[in-house]
């Protein structure tokens, strides 16, 4: 009979503790949001945003630019001198809760803890295969927005997670939201909501479809919204949530809501529980 | 949605959707490069240990959601409407029963059941594809691609570690592209994950790494035979005594046999 | 400074393809929206069709068979293709480009063609 | 599609006076809380120039003389005080439904 080697154990043949080091970049502070850019033009970027700062990597993570988002409040800050001479609202540090592209213009825009939750829109401007941003646009109008109608106050300083859908030559953000009491009563950034960029970029269109967690419930159901995404002709948030409004709150579970993304409005608004289960 | 047996693990901890491959497409009974969703899901919001593993990996294809979501619009709105059905969402609208709108008694003739929110009466089931093999890894990062047809997970975890695992339904073990420690910090990779070309960009503490979607290397498969196994994408041969891909090797490098065994 | 040229045949036969195209300076074709429209005889202008930062296109439908737009985003061009022209599509055609809501704030100067055996 | 009906189809001016053109459309340009309602000047040889967006907001380098009104379904443009530089045919256009479509244009003259 021929002798054969004994066959090596495939947990053997591969050693896990083995040593790769990747290139990195050291951001100051923990990492609150990033997203990237790839331009048609062999231009890209990685935007980081750290508390009170927003940082411009090149393709190689080596810092390109660098923004003072925060303090509010702070003469230092350089998004908040886009919105004029303050005071804009309590001083305080800015999180950046919300930070996407909008492709069309291109534009990155973020969205912070601080200033009512407000918005900023910042040009891309390529320079050769790297990316700056340009000046800081605001994009809050004062006399559009009071604390129970808030077109302009999109991030919550409980999580926001935004989807940027292109219909026609406009930009829809559709914006989901976690909500207590307190952040609902203080330009409250609604649970789910689609909102229009305006062309000039001076905020959000002042009417928008809005779905909020009834005042009554606030205290008890709260949505944590883990993702969203976009795919064919809808746009999707998922959610941990309680499983009921009047049982016990802790007993939490997943769903799924769907959106129209070719239609602004939420009267096809859907959730689905989604179920995943262990099965020895 | 198909099962109801098995531990529940209740809780989203991250997802991602993405096309899949053709070996995967054809276990989810879909066709290749059809969009799924991918969540890592856990027993609780701490994500503490049960009795299975601390992770499990659900799909979902989208067409599937997408169908169960017009089922149960059906299910509210055209007759006969099965007594008792509710519009659900009572944290957002009041309460009210199918095909009535939020609210209100009944409908008036020029009122569309169709045209306000609703909660799917039916739920959609899936079982860990991994088989529970993920054990007391804690996956906090998620980021799927497809590969030469593979369809691949990135995973980052409460450790600080990267998992790069061809997504099938698993039998006995996972089938790693690789299984690295980004840094010496140990801290949880965060939740979000940004592709730049053929890199995926993690951040973990106050640092952004930059890890290709093919893998770091090859050195962490110890022999010729395990070696020449791997991906084709990961572009792994043998080198004298150790497998690493052509860049890292000056002398012979063999892709396509091993030297005999003394 | 923004500039749109518009260039191709002043003159096609009825039957034929009319070919335009937009060359563009001062400005990406990978952002924004770049527009056709034309101006017929007697002031009346038509909204043609646009090609987007990502390629996708609209065309207006009463044109749909017949309109194709396209790009070259190596040379910022891009390009308006009509099919069986008849003597109607005799106008001044222009390239336009819009950032948001077919608002078009930068033009061609316009180039007339003139369909006729 | 949504038919926009400019008047007057021709309006003298004289230099210095204030002039205004009218626009309706066959149905709501509103949506968002937004008038969906842009002006352009063609002047002679010259190709259409942006002068009003969104009912109200100036194009850029647009002369403050030149501004925007209405909502709904009529509107108005607007110039305070008419300069020689000013004649040309202005077209309104909806951009709320597609296709966008134009008003037949008004042509403005010196008496």
């Known amino acids: 009979e021929d002798w054969q080697c004994p066959r090596t154990p495939y947990a053997a043949s591969r050693d896990f503790d083995v040593k790769y080091v990747v290139p990195s970049f050291s951001a100051g502070g923990l990492v609150q949001a990033m997203v990237t850019y790839e331009g048609d033009r062999n231009e890209s970027a990685v935007f980081v945003a750290i508390r009170n700062r927003l940082h411009v990597l090149g393709p190689d993570l080596k810092s390109v630019q660098s923004l003072a988002t925060g303090p509010a409040g702070d003469p230092g800050c350089q998004t908040c001198a886009a919105c004029g001479p303050g005071p804009h609202g309590p001083p305080g540090d800015t999180d950046t809760k919300v930070l996407v592209l909008d492709p069309a213009l291109p534009a990155l825009v973020s969205c912070g803890s601080s200033l009512q939750g407000r918005c900023f829109l910042h040009d891309l401007e390529p320079q050769g295969t790297a990316v700056h941003l340009a000046a800081p646009a605001c994009l809050f109008s004062a006399h559009h927005n009071r604390p129970d109608d808030c077109p302009d106050c999109v991030a919550s300083p409980l999580g926001t997670r935004v989807t940027v859908v292109e219909q026609g030559q406009a930009s829809y953000f559709y914006v989901a939201s976690s909500l207590d009491a307190a952040v609902a009563a203080s330009f409250s950034p609604r649970s789910v909501s689609i909102r229009r960029l305006k062309a000039d970029a001076s905020g959000f269109a002042p009417g928008f479809v809005a779905l909020s967690v009834l005042p009554k419930h606030l205290v008890s159901y709260s949505i944590e919204y883990v993702h969203s995404f976009h795919t064919g002709a809808f746009v999707y948030f998922l959610t941990v949530q309680p499983a009921s409004v009047t049982d016990d709150p802790s007993a939490l579970h997943t769903r799924l809501a769907r959106l129209s993304a070719t239609e602004p409005e939420l009267g096809d608004y859907r959730e689905l529980v989604l179920d995943c289960r262990f099965a020895p | 949605g198909a099962p109801e047996g098995g531990q529940p693990y209740p809780v989203l901890r991250v997802a991602h959707s993405a096309p899949v491959g053709a070996q995967l497409a054809t276990e989810l009974s879909i066709a290749e490069g059809q969009e799924v969703l991918f969540g890592v899901f856990v027993t609780g919001k701490d994500g503490g240990p049960g009795v299975g593993p601390n992770s499990v990996v659900c799909a979902f294809p989208i067409d599937l959601l997408d169908t169960l979501i017009d089922e149960g619009v059906e299910r509210c709105c055209e007759s006969p409407v099965h007594p008792g059905l509710r519009r659900g969402l009572d944290f957002f609208q009041s309460p009210s029963f199918c095909p009535n709108p939020p609210g209100l008694e009944a409908l008036s003739p020029n009122t569309s059941c169709r045209h306000f929110p609703l909660l799917v009466s039916s739920s959609f089931s899936r079982v860990d594809l991994f088989n529970g093999l993920l054990g007391p890894v804690q996956v906090t990062a998620l980021y799927v691609t497809r590969l030469d047809n593979v369809t691949v997970a990135h995973m980052g975890t409460m450790d600080g570690r990267i998992l790069q695992v061809e997504l099938v339904r698993s039998l006995n073990y996972l089938l790693y592209v690789s299984n690295f420690s980004l840094g010496d910090s140990g801290q949880p990779v965060q939740r979000d994950v940004s592709r730049l070309g053929d890199h995926l960009l993690f951040a973990s503490g106050d640092q952004v790494f930059q890890v290709p979607i093919q893998g770091p290397g090859c050195r962490h498969f110890l022999t010729c035979g395990r070696c020449l196994r791997a991906w084709h994408f990961m572009g792994c041969g043998w080198c004298g005594n150790m497998c690493g891909q052509q860049k890292e090797c000056p002398g012979s490098w063999q892709q396509d046999h091993c030297p005999p065994k003394l | 400074e923004v500039q749109l040229q518009e260039s191709g045949p002043s003159l096609v036969k009825p039957s034929q393809t009319l070919s335009l195209t937009c060359s563009v300076t001062?400005?990406?074709?990978?952002?924004?929206?770049w527009n056709w429209i034309r101006k017929f005889p007697g002031n009346k202008l038509e909204y043609m069709g646009y090609?987007?930062?990502?390629?996708?296109?609209y065309y207006n439908p009463s044109l749909k068979s017949r309109i194709s737009i396209t790009r070259d985003t190596s040379k910022n061009h891009y390009y308006l293709q009509l099919i069986s022209v008849t003597a109607e599509d005799t106008a001044t055609y222009y390239c336009a480009r819009s950032k948001y809501d077919y608002a078009m704030d930068y033009w061609g100067q316009g180039t007339s063609v003139t369909v006729s055996s | 599609d949504i038919v926009m009906t400019q008047s007057p189809l021709s309006l003298p001016v004289t230099p210095g006076e204030p002039a205004s053109i009218s626009c309706r459309a066959s149905?709501?340009?509103?949506?968002?809380?937004?008038?969906?309602m842009n002006w352009y000047l063609q002047k002679p040889g010259q190709s259409p120039q942006l002068l009003i967006y969104?009912?109200?907001n100036q194009g850029s380098g647009v002369p403050d003389r030149f501004s925007g009104s209405g909502s709904g379904t009529d509107f108005t443009l607007k110039i305070s005080r008419v300069e020689a530089e000013d004649v040309g045919v202005y077209y309104c256009q909806q951009s709320k439904e597609v296709p966008p479509t134009f008003g037949g244009g008004t042509k403005v003259e010196i008496k």
């Open positions: 090609i987007s930062y990502s390629g996708k296109t």
């Open positions: 001062g400005d990406s074709i990978t952002s924004g929206y």
């Open positions: 969104a009912a109200s």
């Open positions: 149905e709501i340009v509103d949506n968002f809380g937004i008038s969906f």
